[in-house]
């Protein structure tokens, strides 16, 4: 008796839904009375499906109302675990343990990404020095580097600072500021840079005509 996995690594987005799968051999019709399926992560019990019954009493609180076994898939030899509203804490190694005549298990690794998509920006000016402070703030995971460039996409020199804090959902709240001497209509870009492809997000900041503090904008691309 052998359990197999179509994929042993899933990279999923924070807040999305995921379905991870383990396959087991079923000849002709599924005998529910002989089937036991456990899904667990470390020692957290996610699914306990024994002889056709799911026992929610033993389900770990962090998965309550979010995890379910797709029972219509069992007859196809597919023990599929669906988790909705994926959290950062859902990252880790999952195990499907299946007993159906024989017993076997397989491991599945889940990684959770939260792209720094929504970049909030602010521009303020010091009237005394005409120095502008450009600020970009976004939430995501894991750590991102913030890169400042000019309209030619060249690195900008200037005094910069970065602060990082945690949100309630354990995302990283990253705020980067850059102090530069600039004139009206100069264009700057802040890029939240991550090493994985497709994980970079950039906001465009345009120095306004009037030396005033502007409300947050959400212009990103």
């Amino acid at each position: 008796f052998t359990v197999t996995v179509p994929k042993d690594l899933y990279v999923v987005e924070y807040g999305s839904n995921m379905t991870i799968e383990c396959k087991f051999p079923v000849e002709k019709q599924l005998d529910l009375a002989a089937l036991i399926v456990y899904w667990e992560m470390e020692d957290k019990n996610i699914i306990q499906f024994v002889h056709g019954e799911e026992d929610l009493k033993v389900q770990h609180s962090s998965y309550r109302q979010r995890a379910r076994l797709l029972k219509d898939q069992l007859s196809l030899g597919n023990a599929a675990l669906q988790i909705t509203d994926v959290k950062l804490q859902d990252a880790g190694v999952y195990r499907c343990m299946i007993s159906y005549g024989g017993a076997d298990y397989k491991r599945i690794t889940v990684k959770v990404n939260a792209p720094y998509r929504k970049i909030n920006q602010r521009i303020s000016v010091d009237p005394a020095t005409s120095e502008h402070e450009l600020i970009c703030q976004a939430e995501g995971y894991p750590e991102a580097e913030v890169i400042w460039t000019n309209s030619d996409h060249q690195p900008v020199s200037g005094k910069r600072s970065v602060t990082t804090s945690r949100t309630e959902g354990m995302l990283l709240n990253v705020t980067s500021s850059l102090r530069v001497n600039a004139t009206a209509n100069d264009v700057f870009y802040c890029t939240f840079w991550r090493s994985q492809p497709g994980q970079n997000h950039t906001a465009e900041l345009i120095i306004p005509e009037l030396p005033a503090t502007h409300p947050p904008q959400n212009r990103t691309h």
Epitope: I36, Y38, E40, E42, D43, K44, N45, Q48, V50, G92, V93, R95, M97, S99, A103, D104, Y105, R107
Partner: antibody
């Protein structure tokens, strides 16, 4: 901290059944993980024998399948090994162990107990 | 069953030397290979999991590499406490199996 301790007879006669107990402290055997029996023969060769999952599902080494049984007593936080029809070839140090948090490897081991099969 | 062949059977070294221990699988096991150290009259202790992942509390002089069928445990500058037996273990398929071991001894 998780601790495991094997206990049982030092000497078993050929054709008899070898019975060992693993007593676990610091963690409930029903809370999670697989709980294994592993033996080490004179000469150091290690052999995985089988496990009992926290749900009581078992899986055994096919080379022992007809002779081995792993059971448990949750009230005492113990799990047991029974190996029937032993021969002198079954003389070994027997270890109980618990897998690691991401499975597949053995994180916690008992100190081992030597069982000699001899007439 | 997957057979793990360890070599050499015995390695005689002087403290301060750096050494490499080999474990070769009879078929591909991806990275499902773990290394243990066993000192005389003690239980095995995990050193490296999944071929190269370090373990909390294990000195950084121990490192692992390899994938597929060929794996190496490296000890950078052996210390006297490192002498003993070293075993590899595969978890790719049942039954889990161990290598026959490499004895690291003082020259």
């Amino acid at each position: 901290d998780v601790q495991l301790q094997e206990s049982g007879p030092d000497l078993v006669k050929p054709s008899q059944t070898l019975s060992l107990t693993c007593t676990v402290t610091g963690y409930s055997i029903t809370s999670g993980y697989n709980w294994h029996w592993i033996r080490q023969f004179p000469g150091n060769k290690l052999e995985w024998m089988g496990y009992i999952h926290h749900s009581s599902i078992t899986n055994y080494n096919p080379s022992l399948k007809s002779r081995i049984s792993i059971t448990r007593d949750t009230s005492k936080n113990q799990f047991f090994l029974q190996l029937s029809s032993v021969t002198t070839e079954d003389t070994a140090t027997f270890y109980c162990a618990r897998e690691g948090y991401d499975y597949d490897w053995f994180a916690y081991w008992g100190q081992g107990t030597l069982v000699t099969v001899s007439a | 069953d997957i057979v793990l062949a360890q070599s050499p059977a015995t390695l005689s070294v002087t403290p301060g030397d750096s050494v490499s221990l080999s474990c070769r699988a009879s078929q591909s096991i991806s990275n499902n290979l773990h290394w243990y150290q066993q000192k005389s009259h003690e239980s095995p202790r995990l050193l490296i999991k999944y071929a190269s992942q370090s373990i909390s509390g294990i000195p950084s002089r121990f490192s692992g590499s390899g994938s597929g069928t060929d794996f190496t445990l490296s000890i950078n500058s052996v210390e006297t406490e490192d002498f003993g037996m070293y075993f590899c273990q595969q978890s790719k398929s049942w039954p889990f199996t161990f290598g026959s071991g490499t004895r690291l001894e003082i020259k």
